[in-house]
Amino acid sequence: LPKAPVITTPLETVDALVEEVATFMCAVESYPQPEISWTRNKILIKLFDTRYSIRENGQLLTILSVEDSDDGIYCCTANNGVGGAVESCGALQVKMKPKITRPPINVKIIEGLKAVLPCTTMGNPKPSVSWIKGDSPLRENSRIAVLESGSLRIHNVQKEDAGQYRCVAKNSLGTAYSKVVKLEVEVFARILRAPESHNVTFGSFVTLHCTATGIPVPTITWIENGNAVSSGSIQESVKDRVIDSRLQLFITKPGLYTCIATNKHGEKFSTAKAAATISIAEWSKPQKDNKGYCAQYRGEVCNAVLAKDALVFLNTSYADPEEAQELLVHTAWNELKVVSPVCRPAAEALLCNHIFQECSPGVVPTPIPICREYCLAVKELFCAKEWLVMEEKTHRGLYRSEMHLLSVPECSKLPSMHWDPTACARLPHLDYNKENLKTFPPMTSSKPSVDIPNLPSSSSSSFSVSPTYSMT
């Protein structure tokens, strides 16, 4: 008698290793004999597909060499025209030993930045990934974490993070090891001991001492009044990544001496600077009551920044105020070459107006300081990152006390526009027509940035401005 098909052995989940054989059995009782078709993920498997073998009147489906992509739901459908078609489904789970698909590579990273060593894996069950540093398993902590992807992330890289690393991928079927890679930590040039300022008699010998460190070990050059040192002898020694340089001078004129430590990171250089003044005791004769005088600015560095024919205050505590103040600006100006294009024009305006203050002539010529609000705008909006670095240098004593004009002004100590509109000077317009910006950069990092930061852009303003904040 005709009998509708019945599947007597329903399909079950089959586990198979890659490159092995996997077989699904779909035993059917019926009369007449049924037609049996197979699907994978609801797509019909063709009888002539050479990756499969279909035998026993279609009741056995064999995958001849399992691939990772064979994972899925397999169904057999039996139909003999009597009653309805019947179906049974089962899953194929492809098991796979761990395999490292993206191994880690050698990394050179600057101290304080974030390092990521990749380690992307395949396998089923999903392999767990751990890391070995040197010969020991690597412990995770607040800085060091193994990401979901298996990659190793190290925040705020430290010198002690340097070394040899490998990743290990493990599951129930086996273990895979990556090749050993090297993490090299480079460190910005940093001055450990800055040269000290001296007030000496004419014809004295003075030794200026400058010590710096960094990875690679930096080189030290000396600058005298903005130019390479023309006289004097330099002695250098290097020990434990610390370079020690001594400049011996025969003093015949006052000067500003700068120690510059430089090291290379790929194509980029990092520099650290510290300056000292050499003054000659008899040269400086400030008048008792009068600390300076008003004169038209005749220098070069601040030409583009100060108003034409600006009346500036020249400080007579310097032997040659015009030259000394111009030197201060020149030295500080060179520092600004490394800051971002957003910060530089604002910082230049602040610097020139800070060192060559507007002068109020009268019986006692008086310097007019910058208005507090303008100082804050430069500090917090245009140069937030750079200001932190400058303040850090000032606190660490990399700017000597005699060099107080080189350190950044303390905005809070400057007079406000609200007190007396004539008591403080406004900076020229700070409009550089860059991108639209609307939010402040987070003011947390005190490390110098190698690259100019990407400032956030906004869409809700109808004009272009440059800093990370502009008006209210």
């Epitope: 208005c371 507090r372 609000e373 303008y374 804050l376 705008a377 917090e380 909006l381 245009f382 406000s416 526009m417 609200h418 406004r426 317009h429 700070l430 409009d431 639209n436 910006l437 609307k438 939010t439 402040f440 950069p441 987070p442 003011m443 947390t444 906004s458 809700s460 303003s461 109808s462 004009f463 401005v465 800093p467 990370t468 904040y469 502009s470 008006m471 209210t472």
Partner: antibody
């Protein structure tokens, strides 16, 4: 003495237009930033728009963008707020206020002088 | 956009009390924060600018301070004329945000 006087408020139907004026004296509009701030009945302060004449730069709150236009006539020392496509939710007292300095520093000086306000009622 | 969350929304205090009102910025901001006093039917008055600078003519019992993203207005000894609504205000890039206001009432 610094003074700001608003005018131009009144009753207008939804979809209608109004132009508010803010006449300044005791300082020059060109050297300051001018702002419009509104206050719906029984509610808090809400910034509407700002202009810095020295730059010809303007900015608007999202709620009014595309409908309101802020401008200034430095020869008349007056700022304006052109309000189009008015809605019931624009009903408020509109204040004009100034802050010292250009757009970068005015945030640090605060809105130091305010007008007495002008009432705008949008209702059918 | 930066939000300024002001707390409390209202408070009751007596003459002579020390009163503290706080504004918390939703993200890192500059010190371009001001505080205003507003009385019913009147325009707001500037009290504090640049987070901590006292505006000219404002009594010294008012002071402002900053700690990270928290800005505080303190009235050291409340006077009868100080009962009003106080607002903080932050200036972003051409974007001004006010706090919701704090109403200081007589206990």
């Amino acid at each position: 003495e610094v003074q700001l006087v608003e005018s131009g408020g009144g009753l207008v139907q939804p979809g209608g237009s109004l132009r508010l004026s803010c006449a300044a004296s005791g300082f020059t509009v060109s050297s300051s930033s001018i702002h419009w701030v509104r206050q719906a009945p029984g509610k808090g302060l809400e910034w509407v728009a700002s202009i810095s004449s020295s730059y010809g730069s303007t900015s608007y709150a999202d709620s009014v963008k595309g409908r309101f236009t802020i401008s200034a006539d430095t020869s008349k020392n007056t700022a304006y707020l052109q309000m189009n496509s008015l809605r019931a939710e624009d009903t408020a007292v509109y204040y004009c206020a100034r802050s010292e300095g250009d757009r970068y520093v005015s945030g640090y000086s605060g809105l130091d002088y305010w007008g007495q306000g002008t009432l705008v009622t949008v209702s059918s | 956009d930066i939000q300024m969350t002001q707390s409390p929304s209202s408070l009751s205090a007596s003459v002579g009390d020390r009163v503290t009102i706080t504004c918390r910025a939703s993200q890192s901001v500059s010190s371009a924060v001001a505080w205003y006093q507003q009385k019913p039917g009147k325009a707001p008055k500037l009290l504090i600018y640049s987070a901590s600078s006292l505006y000219s003519g404002v009594p010294s019992r008012f002071s402002g301070s900053r700690s990270g993203t928290d800005f505080t207005l303190t009235i050291s000894s409340l006077q009868p004329e100080d009962f009003a609504t106080y607002y903080c205000q932050q200036s972003g890039v051409w974007l001004i945000t006010f706090g919701q206001g704090t109403k200081v009432e007589i206990k």
